[in-house]
């Protein structure tokens, strides 16, 4: 799998996922999350070749079409698999709300 | 929605589905399929900006810091989101066989 | 159900100056992502400006000749556009992006026109 686990311990070239660390105040402006100060989102990148991680019959057949046909533009692309959610303390007024903001830390990447 | 109503009928810049048809045999290299001889796989294509179509709280967040990093090389990815079966006739031996290919055709595209 | 009011659309001649304002529910707009989007006929909607807390961002298009600014205490945003084009002529619109919340997700103002001709 396209995962942490395997990605962050090698040096893949092909799609797979990546370290990004946001900081909500430096890189979105959000002042309003008082914790945490930022989050390990991570993001997907890297070519889609055929038979790497391909995420349906489309995305074979695609990826086939482009080792057969290298200069088009039709080409699979490295995006999220697996998701996970990430919880925020912000306050509304005084008091202080924990929520859960879904789909927010990418753990694998897929070529779809 | 961005699906081939829209996206043939424009000159869209942004995500979008394009259209791609795809020769069995010449692009494939594919002589087992009898019928049909090819077919509209279309692709996906174009920009994901903040809020063009996106699929997730991930995928928003990543187009804000995208925007706000124009240089980072973390962006939502355009992707197919609704795809269809095609329909093919090969034979095994000489008995013809009727098949549905599931997920090989793109109708509509999103931002991942 | 979070409410988007955009206002200030008008007709202005080129070179000229229009201020827009967009007030969204009071409940929600300290913690929105705040943007101006506009769509010129026979075209797709584009981005124009979005005020992200204290972070701005602007279309190459309008850089330089438009502003962007929030008021949290008057729950408004604001986009001042200075020496208007006739390109600039379009239907703008404001969105509100909530993150967080029961009233989480994308909410729409309905558009104010701006014609800039002489």
């Known amino acids: 799998a396209l995962d942490t686990n395997y990605c962050f311990s090698s040096t893949e070239k092909n799609c797979c996922v990546r370290q990004l660390y946001i900081d909500f105040r430096k890189d979105l402006g959000w002042k309003w999350i008082h914790e945490p100060k930022g989050y390990h989102a991570n993001f997907c990148l890297g070519p889609c070749p055929y038979i790497w991680s391909l995420d349906t019959q489309y995305s074979k057949v695609l990826a086939l079409y482009n080792q057969h046909n290298p200069g088009a533009s039709a080409a699979p692309c490295c995006v999220p698999q697996a998701l996970e959610p990430l919880p925020i303390v912000y306050y509304v007024g005084r008091k202080p709300k924990v929520e859960q903001l879904s789909n927010m830390i990418v753990r694998s990447c897929k070529c779809s | 929605a961005l699906d081939t109503n829209y996206c043939f009928s424009s000159t869209e810049k942004n995500c979008c589905v394009r259209q791609l048809y795809i020769d069995f045999r010449k692009d494939l290299g594919w002589k087992w399929i009898h019928e049909p001889k090819g077919y509209h796989a279309n692709f996906c294509l174009g920009p994901c900006p903040y809020i063009w179509s996106l699929d997730t709280q991930y995928s928003k967040v990543l187009a804000l810091y995208n925007q706000h990093n124009p240089g980072a090389s973390a962006a939502p990815c355009c992707v197919p989101q609704a795809l269809e079966p095609l329909p093919i006739v090969y034979y095994v031996g000489r008995k013809p066989k009727v098949e549905q290919l599931s997920n090989m055709i793109v109708r509509s595209c999103k931002c991942s | 159900e979070v409410q988007v009011v955009e206002s200030g659309g008008g007709l202005v001649q080129p070179g000229g100056s229009l201020r827009l304002s967009c007030a969204a529910s009071?409940?929600?707009?300290?913690?929105?992502?705040m943007g101006w989007f506009r769509q010129a006929p026979g075209k797709q909607r584009e981005l124009v400006a979005i005020s992200s807390g204290d972070r701005e961002t602007y279309a190459d298009s309008v850089k330089g000749r438009f502003t962007i600014s929030r008021d949290n205490a008057k729950n408004t945003v604001y986009l001042q556009m200075d020496t208007l084009k006739p390109e600039d002529t379009a239907v703008y619109f404001c969105?509100?992006?909530?993150?967080?919340?029961?009233?989480?997700?994308?909410?729409w103002g309905q558009g104010t026109q701006v014609t800039v001709s002489s």
């Open positions: 009071a409940s929600v707009f300290s913690w929105s992502v």
């Open positions: 969105n509100a992006y909530v993150p967080v919340g029961e009233s989480r997700g994308d909410y």
